[in-house]
């Protein structure tokens, strides 16, 4: 018979034949042959593989480093990685939670809508027209543009969401 060019799901093609992939939690020891099945071995302690695979090495479980404020939220198994979270009152810097911050800052152009608590991180909002923030802050709101008119001045440079307006003297008409 013709050697296969494609294999079924949970199989892989090697040496012109279809071999079974190893199930999650196991790694490949040897490919199948005409006479033998694929040989797989369970991952060791602190290792995992989360897909049907032909990997020869299992992945190490993530380490939740207490020096970065991390702790284990869910212990890893042979089929799943460890899930880290931050100590109480701290917040993950990303979905992967690789490090922790007390709270995040709002970038220039954004103001603080709600200051962080032990439960929720800082909530930022874009500065609307007429307001600006030129700093990165975890507590400052957007500031209103300076009103040149109330100082008997005129706008020399328009404000943006990151900069205040620049006021200047009114042009005096020459007689």
């Amino acid at each position: 018979p013709e050697p296969p060019t494609a294999c079924r799901e949970k199989q892989y093609l090697i040496n012109s034949q279809c071999c079974s992939l190893c199930q999650p939690g196991q790694k490949l020891v040897s490919d199948c042959t005409e006479f033998t099945e694929t040989e797989c071995l369970p991952c060791g302690e602190s290792e995992f593989l989360d897909t049907w695979n032909r990997e020869t090495h299992c992945h190490q479980h993530k380490y939740c480093d207490p020096n970065l404020g991390l702790r284990v939220q869910q212990k890893g198994t042979s089929e799943t990685d460890t899930i880290c979270t931050c100590e109480e009152g701290w917040h993950c810097t990303s979905e992967a939670c690789e490090s922790c911050v007390l709270h995040r800052s709002c970038s220039p152009g954004f103001g603080v809508k709600q200051i962080a608590t032990g439960v929720s991180d800082t909530i930022c909002e874009p500065c609307p027209v007429g307001f600006f923030s030129n700093v990165s802050s975890a507590f400052e709101k957007c500031h209103p543009w300076t009103s040149c008119e109330t100082k008997d001045l005129v706008v020399q440079q328009a404000g943006t969401n990151k900069t205040d307006v620049v006021c200047g003297p009114q042009d005096r008409l020459r007689a």
Epitope: N67, G69, W90, T93, C100, V101, L102, V135
Partner: nanobody
Amino acid sequence: EVQLLESGGGLVQPGGSLRLSCAASGFTFAGYELWWVRQAPGKGLERVSAISGSGGSTYYADSVKGRFTISRDDSKNTLYLQMNSLRAEDTAVYYCARDPYSFDYWGQGTLVTVSS
């Protein structure tokens, strides 16, 4: 290496005052927003007060408004918290923190105990 070292804590009677200091080293202090945060025994972190990089803006938690004053001296690389009219509920370890507020930019704290 960024280091923040808090000092000035101690035992004080209700109604008394303390001034906490936070000495910074390993970075240029000026321009950084800074916070005082506290943790009471068996409780979570509470954000007490903050001061902007320029020193022009400040924030106080409702629980300390009118009693605590935050200030900074960039020439001495030091942050301060003047605490007046202290109450038993102010008992906590006080920490200072710097943007980006990561866990490794975190001092050892200074213990304030308010008790008669």
